[in-house]
Amino acid sequence: QQQTLPKPFIWAEPHFMVPKEKQVTICCQGNYGAVEYQLHFEGSLFAVDRPKPPERINKVQFYIPDMNSRMAGQYSCIYRVGELWSEPSNLLDLVVTEMYDTPTLSVHPGPEVISGEKVTFYCRLDTATSMFLLLKEGRSSHVQRGYGKVQAEFPLGPVTTAHRGTYRCFGSYNNHAWSFPSEPVKLLVTGDIENTSLAPEDPTFPADTWGTYLLTTETGLQKDHALWDHTAQNLLR
């Protein structure tokens, strides 16, 4: 006899990184026939939704109209069919961004390099933070965490054409409160033409759409948005 139902999927739209005072929707997808969904925040019940009619709905949305540091943290959801509850979903780390200041991102030896050269990013922020995050925009999520008093060093090592793309960094005041994003730095890696095929880089997003794509903690859930894998959220734990 099955004691629990399969865990639901949880994700944030448009993104898990939410600028302060902007809106975000937490989505929880369970099964058709679920009569109740519960959203938990930091281990406590946060919201309840009872879809109608339950047999035609397998997803609910919890709307946060005004993101702030108190709403940032770890969310999970569960659902119920009859008297049977599901396993809890994976944890969704909801991050508030655009807090306080803007870091500066630089790259050594420069934004244009040859495949095989050693590259180091530097993220600098002159306010009270000691954790920094370097993110590469694109379909797959590349996130590094670094530490330093006012500056963190992100060594990429010898780069390949796969490292090409647009990078930004954040200062992190705690796991769920990040600074404004830095200005983007586009890394151009050219190969040795004789023996390197120039593979296309990850698709990148124009600066004005930064933060308008989806991150999900579930690798199996395919949406019509650009999909980031769960690396970013695992790094937060």
Partner: nanobody, 118 residues
Framework: DVQLVESGGGVVQPGRSLRLSCAAS????????MGWFRQAPGKGREVVAR????????YYAGSVKGRFTISRDNSKNTLYLQMSSLRAEDTAVYYC???????????WGQGTLVTVSS
């Protein structure tokens, strides 16, 4: 302390060649990267060429590609820049720089002036 000393600058006619040298006071074979930069009057410093130590990977700025060649002789602890087909816009102070670890340009020379003029 490490010292970098450039030489070989001077006045040269357009289309001619010149070779710059950069002598290092320390041993360079373990240094990750060495490079040449230049600064034209009233402009910022820009990279001209750089060379990685162990892999010998060479990078050239687009404006000098095909005309300039960077090389290094670790036995002599010297970096070279062979400049050919020189143009008036190559006029600048040329600096040698050393990056010992791959993280930052640690040391800089004082510079040598190259003037391309007819």
């Amino acid at each position: 302390d490490v010292q970098l000393v450039e030489s070989g600058g001077g006045v040269v006619q357009p289309g001619r060649s010149l070779r710059l040298s950069c002598a290092a006071s320390g041993r360079t074979e373990s240094w990750y990267r060495m490079g040449w930069f230049r600064q034209a009057p009233g402009k910022g410093r820009e990279v001209v060429a750089r060379i990685s130590g162990d892999t010998n990977i060479k990078y050239y700025a687009g404006s000098v590609k095909g005309r300039f060649t960077i090389s290094r002789d670790n036995s002599k602890n010297t970096l070279y820049l062979q400049m050919s087909s020189l143009r008036a816009e190559d006029t600048a102070v040329y600096y040698c720089a050393a990056d010992r670890t791959g993280a930052t340009w640690d040391y800089w020379g004082q510079g040598t002036l190259v003037t391309v003029s007819s």
